[in-house]
């Protein structure tokens, strides 16, 4: 659903002192496009609540209207609550706007839960922890919604940063990064670490903690360690990629990997949870399940309802297993795999039991649509998305939460055949970009 | 079918041990499917849950007393054991033990109970 | 930590008047939620779980209902055996941990 699982987040604090760093494996300067090195002053530029969502602050109109915008790589329009609404502190005023222009269209944007439906215009948008730059953008004008906004998050609006193809009503709205990248001399490249907490978070550090960075224009070194795997851009409409192997600690699921991409397989920002096709889901359970059976934790549990508490600090890490997605390499028969560890795919959730206990939900889910690489992967990693290359890339996060016995990893070459018969290839109809409920 | 059958004195000294055992019989402690908990009641209040335990030995227990309890297994005898330290009159109750069913979720049998006064 | 608010603390009925009780979770527990009862000298019995599902060999009178933060056992026509006091608990938090305060139930 667009609610909880659909929007995600965990806000996060910042990394690992720089002593805890891994040391550089190589220097991939060469290969990189765009601005390299070190981009200041778009580091930790995202904030974030558990579940909530990472948002960065943008402005829209002139004279400048500041509001707090979720980051999603899961859709393509840029929309922006422009109404009052009961969870919104501020909105967008159009009326106040001299640079405001009307496109006399409307939108209507459903979910499987909720809907929110508004006004097309276009108006100069800027990013102040971002480029230097303002763009003429077409923005979505959010007047009516349900369960859309979420109370206490802190955000507006919607930064739909995925292609043309997704976009509403139809893929003539060209998406703002389009319309950024066409305007401005900036690489067509931008690159999130979304950094999760760890531990629950109460109201006041929930609120003053960073979330993480979207560099924009390049790759910052300093956001991750190791080297960068990039995997292909199967098509450009979501980030859609292609896992050819999943393993629980280090053992095969040995499913056709056909499963593992049906009927797509993204990387979505805008989702909290690692979310697997039925069978995936529940292959992968089972196994999980199997690897840590020395306790037994309640149905509702695996199903991401239930909560499981510990006493502050001794949550059994060392029980659970990781998990390992093997994605495509660039160089045919060769994959590399994106290891995370149940820090990541145990989410921390506030407020619930004592301040004597950890409580944490289960963040991996079943989906209908396909694979879902949300906030549980992108927190273990730094994620490029090349968009000039039609590829993305993947690096340890220097901000992932891990302990003194494992690491998450990105690790590789292995050889793998036949991967492309891992795509699926789904049915082409009128409807079929309709489903955006992503439930 | 299962019961389950709470035993142990009746009576503690402030400052010891108080002891229980729960005997399970009609059924197996090592199913999968189970933990197995104790609750107390203080006479004319309500319940309060002590801790639980699964067979292989892994157990929670209530923040506010854990520094004094300990709850362990023995699969072999097919029971479970209660010790909490340092007791003063408060925890003077009736002590229950009980299964975890119901996706581990629900105290779905219990123990009939035993009364354990503190007092010297 | 959740908190679990029971009421009435008391409720005076005859038998063959139906009975309402409420349950009050300080946060949501979604639909993790057990009734159970408890009659003098007597351990608790398990009545209801998952908010609306009847444990085995529980009557059809006894029925749950609600979800998140407010929950209701109705007892539909009181039997004279069903005079007692009647808690709620809680597991959307695990493990099991939380009961509510109780509710007596007793004959006018």
């Known amino acids: 659903t667009h609610l909880g699982i659909r929007l995600p987040l965990r806000s996060g604090l910042a990394g690992p002192p720089l002593g805890l760093r891994l040391p550089r494996e190589t220097d991939e300067e060469s290969e990189e496009p765009g601005r390299r090195g070190s981009f200041v002053e778009m580091v930790d530029n995202l904030r974030g609540k558990s579940g909530q969502g990472y948002y960065v602050e943008m402005t829209v109109g002139s004279p400048p209207q500041t509001l707090n915008i979720l980051v999603d790589t899961g859709s393509s329009n840029f929309a922006v609550g422009a109404a009052p609404h009961p969870f919104l502190h501020r909105y967008y005023q159009r009326q106040l706007s001299s640079t405001y222009r009307d496109l006399r269209k409307g939108v209507y944007v459903p979910y499987t839960q909720g809907k929110w439906e508004g006004e097309l215009g276009t108006d100069l948008v800027s990013i102040p922890h971002g480029p230097n730059v303002t763009v003429r953008a077409n923005i979505a004008a959010i007047t009516e919604s349900d369960k859309f906004f979420i109370n206490g998050s802190n955000w507006e609006g919607i930064l739909g940063l995925a292609y043309a193809e997704i976009a509403r009503p139809d893929d003539s709205l060209e998406p703002f990064f389009d319309s950024l990248v066409k305007q401005t001399h900036i690489p067509n490249i931008f690159s999130l670490q979304l950094c999760g907490a760890g531990f629950p978070l109460n109201q006041t550090e929930a609120l003053a903690s960073v979330g993480g960075s979207m560099i924009i224009g390049g790759i910052d070194h300093s956001l991750y360690t190791g080297r960068l795997w990039y995997t292909p851009i199967r098509r450009e409409w979501y980030y859609e990629v292609i896992i050819v192997r999943v393993e629980i600690n280090g053992q095969d699921l040995k499913m056709d990997c056909k499963e593992y991409n049906y009927d797509k397989s993204i990387v979505d920002s805008g989702t909290t949870n690692l979310r697997l096709p039925k069978k995936v889901f529940e292959a992968a359970v089972k196994s999980i399940k199997a690897a840590s059976s020395t306790e037994k934790f309640p149905d509702g549990f695996w199903l991401g309802e239930q909560l499981v508490c510990w006493q502050a600090g001794t949550t059994p890490w060392n029980i659970f297993p990781v998990i390992s997605l093997y994605l495509m390499g660039e160089v045919t028969n060769q994959s590399f795999r994106i290891t995370i560890l149940p820090q990541q795919y145990l989410r921390p959730v506030e407020d619930v039991a004592t301040s004597q206990d950890d409580c944490y939900k289960f963040a991996v889910s079943q989906s209908s649509t396909g694979t879902v690489m949300g906030a549980v992967i992108m927190e273990g990693f730094y994620v490029v998305f090349d968009r000039a290359r039609k590829r993305i890339g993947f690096a340890v996060s220097a901000c992932h939460v891990h302990d003194e016995f494992r690491t998450a990893a990105v690790e590789g070459p292995f050889v793998t055949a036949d991967m492309e018969d891992c795509g699926y290839n789904i049915p082409q109809t009128d409807e079929s970009t309709l489903m955006t409920g992503r439930a | 079918q299962l019961q389950l059958q709470e035993s142990g004195p009746g009576l503690v000294k402030p400052s010891e041990t108080l002891s229980l055992t729960c005997t399970v019989s009609?059924?197996?402690?090592?199913?999968?499917?189970?933990?197995w908990g104790w609750i107390r009641q203080p006479p004319g209040k309500g319940l309060e849950w002590i801790g639980s335990?699964?067979?292989?030995?892994?157990?929670y227990y209530n923040p506010s007393l854990k520094s004094r309890v300990t709850i362990s297994v023995d699969t072999s005898k097919n029971q479970f054991s209660l010790k909490l330290s340092s007791v003063t009159a408060a925890d003077t109750a009736v002590y229950y033990c009980?299964?975890?069913?119901?996706?581990?979720?629900?105290?779905?049998?219990w123990g009939r109970g035993t009364l354990v006064t503190v007092s010297s | 930590e959740i908190v679990l608010t029971q009421s009435p603390a008391t409720l005076s009925l005859s038998p063959g008047e139906r009975a309402t009780l409420s349950c009050r979770a300080s946060?949501?527990?979604?639909?993790?939620l057990a009734w159970y009862q408890q009659k003098p000298g007597q351990a608790p019995r398990l009545l209801i779980y998952?908010?609306?599902n009847r444990a085995t060999g529980i009557p059809a009178r006894f029925s749950g209902s609600g979800s998140g933060t407010d929950f209701t056992l109705t007892i539909s026509s009181l039997e004279p055996e069903d005079f007692a006091v009647y808690y709620c608990?809680?597991?959307?938090?695990?493990?099991?941990?939380?009961f509510g305060g109780g509710t007596k139930v007793e004959i006018k």
């Open positions: 009980a299964r975890v069913g119901h996706g581990i979720s629900y105290f779905d049998l």
């Open positions: 009609g059924g197996s402690i090592s199913s999968s499917s189970y933990y």
């Open positions: 335990i699964y067979y292989s030995g892994s157990t």
């Open positions: 946060q949501s527990v979604s639909s993790y």
């Open positions: 998952d908010a609306s």
């Open positions: 608990q809680q597991a959307y938090v695990w493990p099991p941990r939380t």
